[in-house]
């Protein structure tokens, strides 16, 4: 015969555990229902009645199946110099991240402890890997036949235009200049941009510095805001 499905609350068999989304209530000595995310235990179970759940109040949340008597308070509102990338709802805490053009150099459980500006690749260098919420831009020197003439955290190296007759050959930081006859092939005008990272959910992992063409010596252990321009010598 198939085993009967037990309805909460029920006394577990000796040595067995309660099922998924149930918990063992020490007082009632019964397996009882947990409350779903967005709810909390308003009344704990007894031997004869199951857990009574209620919705979290405004500005509070529970993210997991639970039997907590009160929902957790959402973090304080994001300050004016941060961006709210996840609103406070009954099921999730608010998450604040760095403003556009910055990344999280030292993360904390919800949000960021230290924001740093995204590295800008100087002329002769292009973006090899774009910045994200939690990692800096990685720059690379422009390979022969390509150039970047900007100081930017988004521009990649672009191919030199190909001339019928070259007036000035291109280099890593300057496009080729053609004589008055038009070039045989030309890139569209304007810099090529990589898309800015879209703020989604903050990742709760600590970034590690990427190798780059001019590594910063400013950080001795894994973290540290980057210099403002990759390969720059400073003042």
């Amino acid at each position: 015969l198939p085993a009967q499905v037990a309805f909460t609350p029920y006394a577990p068999e000796p040595g067995s555990t309660c099922r998924l989304r149930e918990y063992y209530d020490q007082t009632a000595q019964m397996c009882c229902s947990k409350c779903s995310p967005g709810q909390h235990a308003k009344v704990f179970c007894t031997k004869t009645s199951d857990t009574v759940c209620d919705s979290c109040e405004d500005s509070t949340y529970t993210q997991l199946w639970n039997w907590v008597p009160e929902c957790l308070s959402c973090g304080s509102r994001c300050s004016s110099d941060q961006v709210e990338t996840q609103a406070c709802t009954r099921e999730q805490n608010r998450i604040c991240t760095c403003r556009p053009g910055w990344y999280c150099a030292l993360s904390k459980q919800e949000g960021c402890r230290l924001c740093a500006p995204l590295r800008k690749c100087r002329p002769g260098f292009g973006v090899a890997r774009p910045g994200t919420e939690t990692s800096d831009v990685v720059c690379k020197p422009c390979a022969p036949g390509t150039f970047s003439n900007t100081t930017s955290s988004t521009d990649i190296c672009r191919p030199h235009q190909i001339c019928n007759v070259v007036a000035i050959p291109g280099n890593a930081s300057m496009d080729a200049v053609c004589t008055s006859t038009s070039p045989t092939r030309s890139m569209a005008p304007g810099a090529v941009h990589l898309p800015q990272p879209v703020s989604t959910r903050s990742q709760h992992t600590q970034p590690t510095p990427e190798p780059s063409t001019a590594p910063s010596t400013s950080f001795l252990l894994p973290m540290g805001p980057s210099p403002p321009a990759e390969g720059s010598t400073g003042d």
């Epitope: 300050s79 004016s80 110099d81 941060q82 760095c98 053009g101 999280c104 030292l106 904390k108 949000g111 960021c112 402890r113 230290l114 924001c115 740093a116 500006p117 400013s218 950080f219 001795l220 252990l221 894994p222 973290m223 540290g224 805001p225 980057s226 210099p227 403002p228 321009a229 003042d235």
Partner: antibody, heavy 119, light 107 residues
Framework: QVQLVQSGAEVKKPGASVKVSCKAS????????IHWVRQAPGQGLEWMGW????????NYNEKFKDRVTMTRDTSISTAYMELSRLRSDDTAVYYC????????????WGQGTTVTVSS | DIVMTQSPDSLAVSLGERATINCKAS??????VAWYQQKPGQPPKLLIY???TRHTGVPDRFSGSGSGTDFTLTISSLQAEDVAVYYC?????????FGQGTKLEIK
């Protein structure tokens, strides 16, 4: 309320080391970065580096990195800054400071510790 | 390193008059500039951050402006308690650096 209380004045000879303490209260010590800033007599402010007590992450100003060590004792919510091989131009008031949010402008400061280096 | 240069080094202004202090960064720091007030024997006190955001409790006679490399702190109507040394600081990237200070006195 947030408070940073520093150790008392020190007089040291050139070549010696000094260790300044900064006791934090009014917040969770391991949740905020501590910075050290110094000010020579009649001079401006100079950032020496930051230290994160929660995981020992550290970032020293290049100017001081060979001589400065920042540490902490979480059991007593205290940060330390040790400067070695002292010279007369290290005579200054040394401040610990912290910032509330993730950007480095300092909304809380210790009262300062005067370090005098003299033979 | 980014060098922050303040002007003037000292300034004397009559009570009730406007005081203006300038700060120039040696390279673009976006709007990541803070201003502090320091009185003798005290640590600096944060007045303004992100160029123009007043810190909690700072009177509205203090205001800041600028972007890129040029920044200004303005006290619209000088009060006796505003006599102090004022410092700018960029909070853009390490190392964070301060201006040399501007001493503000009453004329």
């Amino acid at each position: 309320q947030v408070q940073l209380v520093q150790s008392g004045a020190e007089v040291k000879k050139p070549g010696a080391s000094v260790k300044v303490s900064c006791k934090a209260s009014g917040y969770t010590f391991t949740e905020s970065i501590i910075h050290w800033v110094r000010q020579a007599p009649g001079q401006g402010l100079e950032w020496m580096g930051w230290f994160y007590p929660g995981s020992d992450n550290i970032n020293y100003n290049e100017k001081f990195k060979d001589r400065v060590t920042m540490t902490r004792d979480t059991s007593i919510s205290t940060a330390y800054m040790e400067l070695s091989r002292l010279r007369s131009d290290d005579t200054a008031v040394y401040y610990c400071a912290r910032h509330e949010g993730p950007y480095v402008y300092f909304d809380y400061w210790g009262q300062g510790t005067t370090v005098t280096v003299s033979s | 390193d980014i060098v922050m240069t303040q002007s003037p080094d000292s300034l004397a202004v009559s009570l009730g008059e406007r005081a203006t202090i300038n700060c120039k960064a040696s390279q673009d720091v976006s709007t990541a500039v803070a201003w502090y007030q320091q009185k003798p024997g005290q640590p600096p006190k944060l007045l303004i951050y992100w160029t123009s955001t007043r810190h909690t409790g700072v009177p509205d006679r203090f205001s800041g402006s600028g972007s890129g490399t040029d920044f200004t702190l303005t006290i619209s109507s000088l009060q006796a308690e505003d006599v102090a040394v004022y410092y700018c600081q960029h909070h853009y990237s390490t190392p964070y650096t301060f201006g040399q200070g501007t001493k503000l006195e009453i004329k």
